[in-house]
């Protein structure tokens, strides 16, 4: 989780801080959304369970050319213990369901806020 505070971060970031920062970034995305997020791109829906961070990254990494979610992609990579590349899929994807990035972000945000409230940071 060392890199989650951004490039200016002086050292390791506590998991609770890292999760709060990810939540705040997702809040920022949802609040600043004017045109359809990522031009209405569709991504695979995921099961919001253990391993969710990698699954979320695997879904979002397939969206290219969308600057609005680049920071989110970087932050999610800090929560995922392995390297994720485009076209990679885990069993956590609901492979028959695609949703808009905006809905994906909204669902992820809701879940992460509850994890934060419950003290589940990893």
């Amino acid at each position: 989780l060392t890199c989650l505070g951004g490039f200016a971060s002086p050292g390791p970031v506590p998991p609770s801080t890292a999760l709060r920062e990810l939540i705040e970034e997702l809040v920022n995305i949802t609040q600043n959304q004017k045109a359809p997020l990522c031009n209405g791109s569709m991504v695979w829906s995921i099961n919001l369970t253990a391993g969710m961070y990698c699954a979320a990254l695997e879904s979002l990494i397939n969206v290219s050319g969308c600057s609005a979610i680049e920071k989110t992609q970087r932050m999610l990579s800090g929560f995922c213990p392995h390297k994720v590349s485009a076209g990679q899929f885990s069993s956590l994807h609901v492979r028959d369901t695609k949703i808009e990035v905006a809905q994906f972000v909204k669902d992820l945000l809701l879940h992460l806020k509850k994890l934060f409230r419950e003290g589940q940071f990893n």
Partner: antibody, heavy 120, light 112 residues
Amino acid sequence: EVQLVESGGGLVQPGGSLRLSCAASGFNIKDTYIHWVRQAPGKGLEWVARIDPANDNIKYDPKFQGRFTISRDNAKNSAYLQMNSLRAEDTAVYYCARSEENWYDFFDYWGQGTLVTVSS
Amino acid sequence: DIQMTQSPSSLSASVGDRVTITCRSSQSIVHSNGNTYLEWYQQKPGKAPKLLIYKVSNRFSGVPSRFSGSGSGTDFTLTISSLQPEDFATYYCFQGSHIPYTFGGGTKVEIK
């Protein structure tokens, strides 16, 4: 307008069962947590249980676990409290409340309460 | 379970008085996420409780500025700087940091 309305209270004999309902409007229960809090006549408030309607993550005060069951029906935007093996000391006004929708920091809306009387 | 002990259990005061209610938790109520989920609720007879203060010292929207909260660790205080007629009620502290969540026993503020 956000509203919570409890129903299902009434007179029940010791050992009996009752199912309380909490009907929500003005928001989606999946976006927050729903809690049950009770208050015996002339006594203080007592937290009973909480449910996350998005995933059925449930927590109880251990003193109620086993006898009370919290549940939800997202299609009806409602939560429930099933109370079994009722005792005289369960006589109370039962409130449902929701956690606020931003960071879930506090209870911002409560129902009006429903009175449960356990007596023979 | 965390016990929340409120004092006094009741008090008599006059309009304009400064009123202080204390709440002590049996152990720290700092959540693992760094927040302290300590709230104060006001309840009038036959009515549902109403939130006054959350996370120790944050006034809920619409709550008059005469209500303030303070404290840390295990000791918390609700202060009403100048008691108004509508403030005669029962006040409860509440910890939402550790399951099972718990309320204090309440402080009834009565007219002297």
